[in-house]
């Protein structure tokens, strides 16, 4: 009798020990995970994060779609709507260069760096070649007439435009449009001015920064958050809090991301900080990630979202700050009338696109999203989509703009910059992070379940035996 009872009690005790051990392993395991994650996401030599941060292991592609103008003469002569037809994708591999001038500052736990720019054309991922021709707005004519609204100078510009046989529109190759060409009109200016023009000129052999970001050594909740950009905490482009440099560069975020969080990040492409909100759970190559998207609210007018009041910098084009979905970044582009929007004027007010025919905004294709692994805060997949537009205004002094009766925010191109963790990297991530966490969770659950089941089963058996013995 004793042997059996002792056996049952022993079984119950073992069950209890297993259950307690499983229970203890939950907070202890979480602590271990947190400790490991905290150690590995710090931006210093020797960590997983640092290795991937210095040079991204993910292949990043930037696809361009060019808006080819179908009716240039009609627009110039009759101020008709601009008919555009998008052509693309034309794909370039970007962000393949390692960060440069990496300098740790132990005093304030920051690391500074430059992000070099480079683009390599990928013919196999493109619909044509870099020599393909497009009819687009004449960038120099539109910009010069905006930068110099002075009627006297506009007469001078008109002489130069006519002499160079320039017009409101021009035919340019993809390579010229993106990376730069010598403009014939600007070449006539008898002063030392930059005569090269291009949507991304200069790009190759340039670098973005200097960025100075927190390395996370003192506080993991600050890791990758930008401290300063080009030596400043503000941009000097916007009023009030709109001018602040908030969050990270979106390549990663501090670990342990919650669905309720609003993720702030700074994008030098759009000359501002912006934010993303949780949309859905996604399974990316076996890794559970959170999909964060840029909400339409971020592009709203101050009427719809008062927080955006300081992004409205002028009253005329914005129709007294009631227009939405376009951002005037001219202050960030040496006065050139550049407007940033989402592709096809997604989330933009009807007045913005009423002068353009041929646009088809589509949330799935044209919004920006980030897929973030919540434990590490790493962005494992993203699609950054934006459209670059140029404002062109009527001018009674410039012949080629004389017959325009209204302002046009002219779409030049839109881009889709994407990156997805590679299969090898995903496998490694699964084994090193997700796998280990899942394994730990599984062990916890098995120990707890087996322990509880053993304890309950042995206790019931023991009680049953006891009651039989008493009878």
């Amino acid at each position: 009798g004793c042997d059996r009872n002792c056996g049952l009690i022993t079984g119950a005790v073992i069950g209890a020990v297993l259950a307690v051990f499983g229970g203890i392993l939950m907070p202890v395991g979480d602590m271990l995970i947190q400790k490991t994650i905290k150690k590995e996401v710090v931006l210093e030599e020797g960590t997983i994060a640092f290795k991937n941060w210095v040079k991204t292991g993910t292949e990043i592609y930037r696809q361009f779609w060019i808006f080819d103008v179908q009716n240039p003469q009609e627009v110039m002569m009759n101020s008709s709507n601009i008919q555009v037809k998008q052509r693309g994708p034309y794909t370039y591999r970007v962000r393949f260069l390692a960060k440069e001038n990496i300098t740790q500052d132990p005093k304030d736990n920051t690391v500074s760096f430059l992000q070099p720019n480079g683009a390599i054309f990928e013919p196999s991922l493109s619909v044509g070649t870099e020599a393909d021709n497009f009819t687009v707005l004449n960038l120099a004519v539109a910009a010069a007439s905006h930068i110099y609204p002075n009627p006297f100078v506009q007469v001078v510009l008109n002489s130069l435009i006519n002499k160079s046989k320039s017009s409101m529109f021009q035919v340019r190759t993809l390579r010229e449009l993106l990376w730069g060409y010598t403009d014939p009109f600007l070449s006539l200016v008898p002063y030392p001015v930059s005569t090269r023009v291009g949507m991304f000129y200069p790009y190759n052999n340039t670098a973005d920064g200097v960025y100075k970001v927190f390395n996370g050594k003192d506080s993991i909740s600050k890791v990758a958050i930008i401290d300063t950009y080009k030596g400043k905490r503000n941009l000097s482009y916007w009023e009030s809090y709109c001018d602040m440099i908030n969050g990270t560069d979106a390549a990663s975020f501090p670990p342990f991301v919650e669905k309720s969080q609003v993720l702030q990040f700074f994008s030098s492409d759009i000359c501002r900080s912006i934010y993303a909100v949780f949309e859905s759970d996604v399974n990316l190559k076996g890794i559970p990630v959170y999909r964060f998207v840029l909400p339409s609210k971020a592009f709203a007018s101050p009427v719809q979202n008062p927080d955006n009041h300081c992004f409205c910098t002028e009253k005329i084009i914005s129709k007294n700050c009631t227009s939405y979905g376009v951002l005037d970044i001219s202050k960030c582009k040496e006065g050139k009338p550049v407007y940033i929007s989402l592709p096809h004027f997604l989330y933009a007010s009807p007045d913005v696109s009423e002068t353009i025919d041929g646009l088809n905004p589509n949330e799935e294709e044209h919004r920006t999203y980030l897929d973030i692994e919540p434990i590490t805060g790493f962005t494992l997949q993203f699609a950054k989509r934006l459209q670059v537009n140029l404002l062109v205004k009527p001018s009674n002094k410039i012949q080629v703009l004389k017959r325009l009766k209204r302002n046009y925010i002219v779409p030049i191109l839109w881009l889709n910059e994407t990156g997805t963790i590679g299969d090898e990297k995903a496998k490694m991530f699964r084994s090193q992070v997700t796998g280990k966490i899942n394994l730990l969770g599984l062990i916890e659950m098995i120990l707890l379940s087996v322990g509880v089941v053993m304890f309950v089963a042995f206790m019931i058996s023991y009680c049953a035996c006891r009651s039989k013995t008493i009878k």
Partner: antibody, heavy 117, light 107 residues
Framework: EVQLVESGGGLVQPGGSLRLSCAAS????????IHWVRQAPGKGLEWVAW????????YYADSVKGRFTISADTSKNTAYLQMNSLRAEDTAVYYC??????????WGQGTLVTVSS | DIQMTQSPSSLSASVGDRVTITCRAS??????VAWYQQKPGKAPKLLIS???SLYSGVPSRFSGSGSGTDFTLTISSLQPEDFATYYC?????????FGQGTKVEIK
């Protein structure tokens, strides 16, 4: 070195004509455009005429419109001011000046035009 | 036409003085204002363009300020060679117009 040299001034009777020349060196006049500015004795400066770059448009002060004509000979790198139907109030030192953005960075030494009977 | 009104029309000052000349445009000319110095029997010389931009070779004691309709030329410490007549000019719109001039004389 940029230089502007005016010539052609002198004494002329009311109703008469005169042609001023402005010879430029050190730059191409067609790239900049040339202005004529005058200064009556003891008075301030008065803008008179302008020829825009690359033989573009010509502009005149209301006081000389229809009487004065500005022109340029790019082969000689010289600008001219043809002055017809001259009046006593046209008496002044006439300067030619270089400008692109509307301010005058180089001036000639001036030539005196006296309209008197 | 845009009128440029300069004040004062003349002033007396001593070497080392700070001198301020003002110019008012009859309509908004943004920052398209130039300042010139003219000595008797000589052609004017450019001092400042775009209201504030000092022309090359001009001493740093000369400075310009203003935007819209009100503009100022300041000589921080008057030197003997600065006694001359000063003109403002708008280069925003044709016809280009000058102020009537300010004569700076020795006190």
């Amino acid at each position: 070195e940029v230089q502007l040299v005016e010539s052609g001034g002198g004494l002329v009777q009311p109703g008469g004509s005169l042609r001023l020349s402005c010879a430029a060196s050190g730059f191409t006049i067609s790239s900049f455009g040339i202005h004529w500015v005058r200064q009556a004795p003891g008075k301030g400066l008065e803008w008179v005429a302008w020829i825009a770059p690359y033989g573009g448009e010509t502009y005149y002060a209301d006081s000389v419109k229809g009487r004065f004509t500005i022109s340029a000979d790019t082969s000689k790198n010289t600008a001219y001011l043809q002055m017809n139907s001259l009046r006593a109030e046209d008496t002044a030192v006439y300067y030619c000046a270089r400008s692109f953005f509307g301010y005058f960075d180089y001036w000639g030494q001036g030539t005196l035009v006296t309209v008197s009977s | 036409d845009i009128q440029m009104t300069q004040s004062p029309s003349s002033l007396s000052a001593s070497v080392g003085d700070r001198v301020t000349i003002t110019c008012r445009a009859s309509q908004d000319v943004s920052n398209w204002v130039a300042w010139y110095q003219q000595k008797p029997g000589k052609a004017p010389k450019l001092l400042i363009s775009y209201a504030t931009s000092l022309y090359s070779g001009v001493p740093s004691r000369f400075s310009g300020s203003g935007s819209g309709t009100d503009f100022t030329l300041t000589i921080s410490s008057l030197q003997p060679e600065d006694f001359a007549t000063y003109y403002c000019q708008q280069h925003s719109n044709a016809p280009l117009t000058f102020g009537q001039g300010t004569k700076v004389e020795i006190k």
